[in-house]
Interface confidence: medium
Amino acid sequence: IQIPEEYEGHHVMEPPVITEQSPRRLVVFPTDDISLKCEASGKPEVQFRWTRDGVHFKPKEELGVTVYQSPHSGSFTITGNNSNFAQRFQGIYRCFASNKLGTAMSHEIRLMAEGAPKWPKETVKPVEVEEGESVVLPCNPPPSAEPLRIYWMNSKILHIKQDERVTMGQNGNLYFANVLTSDNHSDYICHAHFPGTRTIIQKEPIDLRVKATNSMIDRKPRLLFPTNSSSHLVALQGQPLVLECIAEGFPTPTIKWLRPSGPMPADRVTYQNHNKTLQLLKVGEEDDGEYRCLAENSLGSARHAYYVTVEAA
């Protein structure tokens, strides 16, 4: 039997399948448009509808905004034609694609409106410290739903050189294991880069004043981060795990990492930031257990134990 080409598949029906959707978390900034994506396949052709916070949401019926809705698609863009509009559309969205055979549902898409990030206005007092002592210059970037990159510079836009003695922590603070008179500068500036808003903001400059001494006193290591002797944390399977230890002391301490509960997974471990950071790529069940950092100098040592519990993502 020969079936004409134009007839082939004509009566083949397919239930809806979501083929493309927005990420689960979507951050919108004041000058941005809002684009929510939902594409689906199915025969007969699928019909789309959206809910926001569980209530039927019709983009085209929203007042005071311009909406572009793609034909044969659930995707739409709301044009931000005023400075308040993103606030109005915060919420949890869901797309439903339906035909005679059923309905497919997207995951929940949490739309968050954020202001362009700003540092709180503050007066930064000079930091005074004796040569050889340790010091921490705080960054404390403003909270943000999106990831940010932090770096320290001086007023000439030159990066502050980091080494075993001077380190920026994961939290953005700048740690000095011991200060030298050459660290005496009035313009330590923490910059935060928010890729989502294409924004770079900078903290007020910190004036670090180092008082010279005739004899620097040797000090055994002490951990500046973490400050306690042990901590428990949960790592998700398949995700990276980052552990950090930053120490002070004179001479500058060195950091070693040990795993008392078994061998270090050498093929998946990298050490960064002059050994102060241990990064484990793609955590597995076998990575459960204790990880220990050891800070050592000629006068002694300090340690921190991380107890890691691996859970399914």
């Epitope: 000058t31 400075s83 919420g91």
Partner: antibody, heavy 118, light 113 residues
């Protein structure tokens, strides 16, 4: 730190036009809406309009829609407000201010005094 | 347009006294999507630009002394100065940024006896 520096005082005759500038620094110019607000002598604050520097989109108070034009030059991080067909009642201090759709107008320029007198 | 009405138009108090001023809007300033009231309070000292004190009706702007507080929801709002200082002499404006055009109250003038 964020700074908005406005152009100097202007003395204009009725019927003339004036173009005020607001030079921004210390933040990413295209990430915030720029607002314009005026204050007549001894009077309260009046919102004129706003502009999105990233795409030039504007919103105006209906009272000013026919006479005010907001614009930006992103290459020099500067916002402008032009007001035409000036009347004596337009004598006021004109402020630019930042608003990011979130925290209200939290940074203001120092203001520009426009005097309209024959 | 949303009309903002402030009262009193002026008040004179002694240093150390508690002071409250009111702001009423002709429509609700509460957004249901985020449960925030889009109302701000500004302080304007003679010859200066306005300065933001409070946003979202009750959130104090960073660097603003904690003697300033905002309260209220919907259409009725209050700015309170718990213990007035001589430097608080100024005009205080409320402003709605819920709907266009943004509108300000006519202001409350605070003076020291």
């Amino acid at each position: 730190q964020v700074q908005l520096v406005q152009s100097g005082s202007e003395l204009k005759k009725p019927g003339a036009s004036v173009k005020l500038s607001c030079k921004a620094s210390g933040y990413t110019f295209t990430s915030y809406w720029m607002q314009w607000v005026r204050q007549a002598p001894g009077q309260g604050l009046e919102w004129i309009g706003e502009i999105n520097p990233s795409n030039g989109r504007t919103n105006y108070n209906e009272m000013f829609k026919s006479r005010a034009v907001l614009s930006v030059d992103t290459s020099v991080s500067t916002a402008y407000m032009q007001l035409c067909s000036l009347k004596a009642e337009d004598t006021a201090v004109y402020y630019c201010a930042l608003y990011d759709g979130y925290y209200a107008m939290d940074y203001w320029g120092q203001g520009t005094l426009v005097t309209v007198s024959s | 347009d949303i009309v903002m009405t402030q009262s009193p138009s002026s008040l004179a108090v002694s240093v150390g006294e508690r002071v409250t001023m009111s702001c009423k809007s002709s429509q609700s300033l509460l957004y249901s999507s985020n449960q925030k009231n889009y109302l701000a309070w500004y302080q304007q000292k003679p010859g200066q630009s306005p300065k933001l004190l409070i946003y979202w009706a009750s959130t104090r702007e960073s660097g603003v002394p904690d003697r300033f507080s905002g309260s209220g929801s919907g259409t009725d709002f209050t700015l309170t100065i718990s213990s007035v200082k001589a430097e608080d002499v100024a005009l205080y404006y409320c402003q709605q940024y819920h709907s266009y055009p943004f509108t300000f109250g006519q202001g409350t003038k605070l003076e020291i006896k």
